[in-house]
């Protein structure tokens, strides 16, 4: 059999091999498509099927406007002038080229070492569904699930049967890599002799993640003075992306605790007294230590705030300007 690819909405003519070009003709066309349940034999006199498949005077079959439901098999059986039976067999597939794909909601810039959504590539009105691919600086981008993530969605229009494809690209640019990457997206139907459709490229600037703007050590209760058996909460607040690892120091020695931006001291006793600070370790900027705070365990009504603890502000914070 012969494979035929026809564009949706366009006419298609299938020739009946061996059929005399003029009547009298002995021929039979039958089809098995989305419009039939089994084989449908077409009447040579014409009829209700003529709007979708009509036998022409020369014996060929005309599909005036191919649609998705016309995909299938078409067969002609003809007797030629010498009385020999000749068969033709066609496998028809249809396609529709979508509009030019577009990158919607593109990023304005990217930050190195963190996940960034580049944008969403959208293609509307294809058949069959086809595929969307991303390119970086003209080279195909292969999603690896780590530095390059692609989230895809395919929807089919309930009436037309055409597809809409969406592909969302997220990347983690490496530090010290290209500073102005160019991203583009292409749609491919996967049919022979059909070139991919490309979006307009977008060029983005990669920003190195800046150092933390400051570390704040928040203490609760304010002032760092707590009654025996009370609870102290120390919070290391840092405005860096991605959030760095936070370790704790007491009286100049690291505390053997898992990294956490919060240090909880429940049921404090005099052994918990001391000077506390937090150390934020950022992959690209090394460690940064907060100003220290003093924790004192005393009966309520004791003398005022200890040296090194928070003074007049009443905010229970110490800020370090970088």
């Amino acid at each position: 059999g012969q494979n035929i690819t026809a564009r949706i909405g366009e006419p298609l003519v299938l020739s009946c091999k061996g059929a005399p070009k003029k009547p009298p003709q002995q021929l039979e066309w039958k089809l098995n498509t989305g419009r039939t349940e089994a084989w449908k034999v077409l009447s040579p006199q014409g009829g209700p099927w003529d709007s979708v498949a009509q036998i022409l005077p020369n014996g060929s079959l005309l599909l005036p406007a191919t649609g998705i439901v016309d995909e299938g098999t078409f067969r002609c059986r003809a007797t030629n002038r010498r009385g020999k039976e000749v068969k033709s067999n066609y496998r028809v597939r249809v396609y529709q080229i979508p509009g030019k794909p577009e990158i919607v909601d593109p990023a304005s810039e990217l930050t190195a070492s963190v996940p960034n959504k580049v944008g969403t590539c959208v293609s509307e009105g294809s058949y069959p569904a086809g595929t969307l691919s991303w390119h970086l600086d003209g080279k195909l981008l292969i999603p690896d699930g780590k530095e390059t993530l692609v989230k895809e969605e395919t929807r089919r229009h309930p009436e037309t049967g055409l597809f809409t494809l969406r592909s969302e690209l997220t990347v983690i640019p490496t530090q010290g890599g290209t500073t102005h990457p160019t991203f583009s997206c292409s749609f491919s139907l996967g049919l022979p002799r059909r070139r991919p459709l490309n979006t307009a490229p977008i060029q983005l600037r990669v920003r190195e993640p800046g150092p933390p703007e400051g570390i704040q050590l928040l203490v609760e209760p304010e002032g760092g003075i707590v009654a025996p058996g009370g609870t102290v909460t120390l919070t290391c607040a840092i405005s860096a992306q991605p959030p760095p690892q936070v370790h704790w120091i007491k009286d100049g020695a690291p505390l053997p605790l898992a990294p956490s931006p919060v240090l909880l001291l429940p049921e404090v006793g005099h052994a918990d007294e001391g000077t506390y600070s937090c150390v934020a370790t950022h992959p690209s900027h090394g460690p940064q230590e907060s100003p220290p705070v003093s924790i004192r365990v005393t009966e309520t009504g004791d003398e005022g705030p200890a040296e090194g603890s928070v003074g007049e502000s009443g905010l229970g914070t110490l800020a370090l300007a970088l």
Partner: antibody
């Protein structure tokens, strides 16, 4: 709103001619096949004639072939049925309907027009 | 030519009943069968298209089904407004053929 309005019916003697018209509105006329269907008093429905959307293919049952001619004027969104050599058995209510091919099976009908063939 | 043998020719039923009208096609017509309702003095109205699909605006108590060459129209929980003649039609081959009709009346 889709509307099909027939006209041209009446009383006619056997052997004479009559032309029915059907003016349509509310849809793109030249996108659809059109068909005439008739109903004899107290009897069933009978297909009379169909025409494709461009007007270059027409279809008839043997009972009216060579006597009736279906045609259309797409510019005027009008369907016609020219009936010649009328017989008493052609007495019926004639309906203009949208469709006639496998894609559209008579989804809209006119109100019908009565044709009486009698001497 | 294809024959569409419709039965019964008439039926007298009670409100709330479920009724089924059938048409048998003398040869294969695939899915290309429609059902029409016709009230006295009115034009036919398409109820079911391509054997099983409910036409726009038709109440869901109407349904169409097919088993081989037998096509059925079912009305569940019949209402007074359903009193009418019902016709099947094959539109797969010329000449297009209607069934002889079924008159549905209330007892």
């Amino acid at each position: 709103e889709v509307q099909l309005v027939e006209s041209g019916g009446g009383l006619v003697q056997p052997g004479r001619s009559l032309k029915l018209s059907c003016v349509v509105s509310g849809f793109t006329f030249n996108n659809y096949w059109m068909t005439w269907i008739r109903q004899t008093p107290g009897k069933g429905l009978e297909w009379v004639a169909s025409i494709n959307n461009s007007g270059d293919n027409t279809y008839y049952p043997d009972s009216v072939k060579d006597r009736f001619t279906i045609s259309r004027d797409n510019a005027k969104s009008t369907l016609y049925l020219q009936m010649n050599s009328l017989r008493s058995e052609d007495t019926a209510t004639y309906y203009c309907t949208r469709g006639g091919d496998i894609t559209t099976g008579f989804d809209y009908w006119g109100q019908g027009v009565m044709v009486t063939v009698s001497s | 030519d294809i024959q569409m043998t419709q039965s019964p020719s008439s039926m007298s039923v009670s409100l709330g009943d479920t009724i089924t009208i059938t048409c048998r096609a003398s040869q294969d017509v695939g899915i290309y069968v429609n059902w029409f309702q016709q009230k006295p003095g009115k034009s036919p109205r398409r109820m079911i298209y391509r054997a099983t699909n409910l036409a726009d605006g038709v109440p869901s108590r109407f349904s169409g089904s097919r088993s081989g060459s037998i096509y059925s129209l079912t009305i569940s929980s019949l209402e007074s407004e359903d009193v009418a003649d019902y016709h099947c039609l094959e539109f797969d081959e010329h000449p297009l053929t209607f069934g002889s009709g079924t008159k549905v009346e209330i007892k």
